[in-house]
Interface confidence: low
Amino acid sequence: KIDACKRGDVTVKPSHVILLGSTVNITCSLKPRQGCFHYSRRNKLILYKFDRRINFHHGHSLNSQVTGLPLGTTLFVCKLACINSDEIQICGAEIFVGVAPEQPQNLSCIQKGEQGTVACTWERGRDTHLYTEYTLQLSGPKNLTWQKQCKDIYCDYLDFGINLTPESPESNFTAKVTAVNSLGSSSSLPSTFTFLDIVRPLPPWDIRIKFQKASVSRCTLYWRDEGLVLLNRLRYRPSNSRLWNMVNVTKAKGRHDLLDLKPFTEYEFQISSKLHLYKGSWSDWSESLRAQTPEEEPTGMLDVWYMKRHIDYSRQQISLFWKNLSVSEARGKILHYQVTLQELTGGKAMTQNITGHTSWTTVIPRTGNWAVAVSAANSKGSSLPTRINIMNLCEAGLLAPRQVSANSEGMDNILVTWQPPRKDPSAVQEYVVEWRELHPGGDTQVPLNWLRSRPYNVSALISENIKSYICYEIRVYALSGDQGGCSSILGNSKHKAPLSGPHINAITEEKGSILISWNSIPVQEQMGCLLHYRIYWKERDSNSQPQLCEIPYRVSQNSHPINSLQPRVTYVLWMTALTAAGESSHGNEREFCLQGKAN
């Protein structure tokens, strides 16, 4: 009913709550002397469904049969219309359309932890659209029954607030849920279980790890569990991995030895528990324990390479380079590298520990046979030393690889190819491809890169430390016993025309010809490997085409003679540089007049 209904009544039959698809009769009747003021037959009763007029009748009452009402609540209002006045609201009613509850399905109960309380969940089935009450009943041994009601509109969970104890773990309990509304009731199938079936242990806590004698091979994981736990499963993985290692253990009593951990690796560990081999469910995973395993002595050997540089008649500079061990080989933080330099015939040796670098330079006599050994040390020990005999890597001309080429291969890669040396190719034990940024003046501080290639390979893709628009000096070494041969080439991964031309810094006259000297183009403006320089000249005030002389690029060259200038004529000279992509803009212009006599 709505409003006070002082003027009349609205009745609904058979009920205000009906099953979907049912028909209802709605009657609106006026109370005595509540009609229109003058003439009661002028009474016009109108029935509204929400705001839409669905029926009307002149007189003291109105009957209406209504079908097809939708699920949910529908509001009907009866109004009186008299001549020359507004409609007056008489009374109204709400009709609730719904369905009887379906049988609740998949009833399941759980108790979280031995000290937890029993809670059950179920699937309600389709919405009844009516107020529906759920009653959960749990019956156990000794005729004990617990009951709890839920009046929430969407009820599919109830916590009994009681704790099942393990005194008789095999005792049966039965749970049942019943749904009731105005249109009917329905009960779930009973769910029967024991203590062991429904208790889900709390996840293990207080997880710790111990490494006996700081060794990764003697590692024990400890944790605490609820008292009745019989089974555990452990999962662990390196922190940077997505894949877990899994171990199942029985009667672990809060400890387990792990035998396959890698040294110097941060691991994540989690543990789950269960009360019975085949009853009940696993606990949630414990909170993660993160721990780093101890170091072990390095395995593997360093990849070592070297460069020799002539200083004077009696001395040479040796620069040693080596690559870091991989994480799995280093097995700890590398504290230092140990370099031993030995003269093989005289037996003199010197050892040095190097920290923070992967290179070492020293000066040794040019005489004698020298060897080096390099190893990496962490807190637990050293790797096996890599031994190298220092030799003239390019001395054996017959071992020099042939037809070396270097071509751009995609973004920041260079493909180096070669042909085996003329001398018996089967004598080659390995090739080494070495590359470094080309710096005029042969700067020895420029980082050196190298890779090793098997003797049957005739190509290598170099990509490490390769930058676009930089020229690299690439050498291919063929090594055979204590001999080596090499060939070199310049290469770049990407090139374009140089950004500027060489800067002419001097023009000098020598015996009727001139010598032009220039400064190298800064490396960052070369935009790849230079192929040629061009020297242009023309008479100062002439409109004729300039003459030019093209000279191949050589790293160390920065002067060139020209002998075709006429005496006592003023010339303008300038230079450009070329890569495979094109020619630079002009460098600076210089004027010059040859003073010598005409031939």
Epitope: E268, E287, S288, L289, R290
Partner: nanobody, 129 residues
């Protein structure tokens, strides 16, 4: 840029209560670890309470405050709170809010200052009669 702003500190008598707030702006931290630290004069900054940031937000507490302090957050408002009850004189300190840009599910890591990428300026809590 990211900013964390603490508020709610003040002078309170022993046994009293306070609710500290930390409002984050500049990015959303709803899925990431956040924590409260405190620093008394002449001591190191110490961990008080933290939220893991993983699904379901595990709460971590230092033993000295367990049961008296409650950490919570409202992801929609990008705000974190620390409810402090039964205050003691030894709770006197500057309280700092900290936020990480990752989930932290290890008790060892949640306590480390280095775990957190952003810090607030702090709010003073003084407990005195």
């Amino acid at each position: 840029q990211v900013q964390l702003q603490e508020s709610g500190g003040g002078l309170v008598q022993p046994g009293g209560s306070l609710r500290l707030s930390c409002a984050a702006s500049g990015r959303t931290f709803s899925n990431y670890a956040m924590a409260w630290f405190r620093q008394a004069p002449g001591t190191e900054r110490e961990f008080v309470a933290g939220l893991s940031g993983s699904g379901g937000d595990t709460a971590f507490y230092d033993n000295s405050v367990m049961g008296r302090f409650t950490i919570s957050r409202d992801s929609a408002k990008n705000t974190m709170w620390l409810q402090i009850n039964n205050l003691k004189p030894e709770d006197t300190a500057v309280y700092y809010c900290a936020a990480a840009t990752h989930v932290v599910v290890s008790y060892g890591l949640v306590r480390r200052r280095g775990t957190y990428d952003y810090w607030g300026q702090g709010t003073q809590v003084t407990v005195s009669s």
